[in-house]
Amino acid sequence: PGPPPGSPRASPDPRAELDSTVLLTRSLLEDTRQLTIQLKDKFPADGDHNLDSLPTLAMSAGALGALQLPSVLTRLRADLLSYLRHVQWLRRAMGSSLKTLEPELGTLQTRLDRLLRRLQLLMSRLALPQLPPDPPAPPLAPPSSTWGGIRAAHAILGGLHLTLDWAVRGLLLLKTRL
């Protein structure tokens, strides 16, 4: 009787998925860069700012070569999820003070959420270990003052920019291994 009928290609394969994930990450990187410029223009930073609750940078670009696909995707998802929470927190806690950064901050949050979903789907298609997309996390304390919130905004956008830059390099490298 011959082989059974096949299925038409219904959805993008993981390599195409990785391509579109890189494009989305690049676009988010540009959004973050523009938002950082806006923030510095409206609220100039006096040096570098840190926030203890932010993740430490996953890896230097030079050390990427030794990384494996599962560890890169797992770490990237965990870090981006933390940044998503921080952006949500920033918008809630600093709504009135940072209203000049809306709707850009809202767009950033939406795209970050979309990137996280894309990474989740990619990990599922590859059958890599799954992490809960919405793990419980301790609530972030409100900023002590308006200026404290602005310093936090500088730290969040600066850290997110570095993480996304690392992500683009990492994802491009991993594409060659898939």
Partner: antibody, heavy 114, light 112 residues
């Protein structure tokens, strides 16, 4: 066109063994995690096992843990399921599936009976 | 018993809209994992209908849509047709099982 073709099913006695194969074509097999899912006659779908795109991660349903082994050969575009210590309750159509799963084969019937 | 709960049956007349629910828990849908839906026509293999809660694979008509909220998800079929008569299954990853879980399936009957 994506094609997944299972083989190796048949009638086997309780306690016996079978090895199922699934030949893949029409897509980049080595880029997809692969699953085995089964369906007992007249029943719903039950996930059996999954193996990551490169074979480094393998997970099993509790009902088959220690008895079934999933493996793959990316150079041959083939997925395998080694089934040992078979029981009557393992009787089902066994499907291989790729990705989420996005694509499914037509299935192969495994009957465990004395 | 399935980890994801679906009504065993659903029905509607041609042209109608029907909805099939899928209820999970904090270890699967409630943990934020995506829900996927499959259609199994009589005597055939399952086919992916909706992935990632609300994404349609190419070739699937826009009469089919999915949504998710909290620990539940639902599949909606509008403009019901006789060829939609099939079994429908939801699926999601489950932390406690370290693998995907399926709902028990819903048999959709198109009346008349």
């Amino acid at each position: 066109e994506v094609q997944l073709l299972e083989s190796g099913g048949g009638l086997v006695q309780p306690g016996g063994s079978l090895r199922l194969s699934c030949a893949a074509s029409g897509f980049t097999f080595s880029s997809y995690g692969m699953h085995w899912v089964r369906q007992a006659p007249g029943k719903g779908l039950e996930w059996v096992s999954v193996i990551s795109y490169d074979g480094s991660y393998k997970y099993y349903a509790d009902s088959v843990k220690g008895r079934f082994t999933i493996s793959r050969d990316n150079s041959k575009n083939t997925l395998y399921l080694q089934m040992n210590s078979l029981r009557a309750e393992d009787t089902a159509v066994y499907y291989c599936a790729a990705g989420v799963p996005d694509y499914w084969g037509q299935g192969t019937l495994v009957t465990v009976s004395s | 018993q399935s980890v994801l709960t679906q009504p065993p049956s659903a029905s509607g007349t041609p042209g109608q809209r029907v909805t099939i629910s899928c209820t999970g828990s904090s270890s699967n849908i409630g943990a934020g994992y995506d829900v996927h839906w499959y259609q199994q026509l009589p005597g055939t293999a399952p086919k992916l209908l909706i992935y990632s809660n609300n994404e349609r694979p190419s070739g699937v008509p826009d009469r089919f849509s999915g949504s998710k909220s909290g620990t539940s998800a639902s599949l909606a079929i509008s403009g019901l047709r006789s060829e939609d008569e099939a079994d429908y299954y939801c699926a999601a990853w489950d932390d406690s099982l370290n693998g995907p879980v399926f709902g028990g399936g819903t048999k959709l009957t198109v009346l008349g």
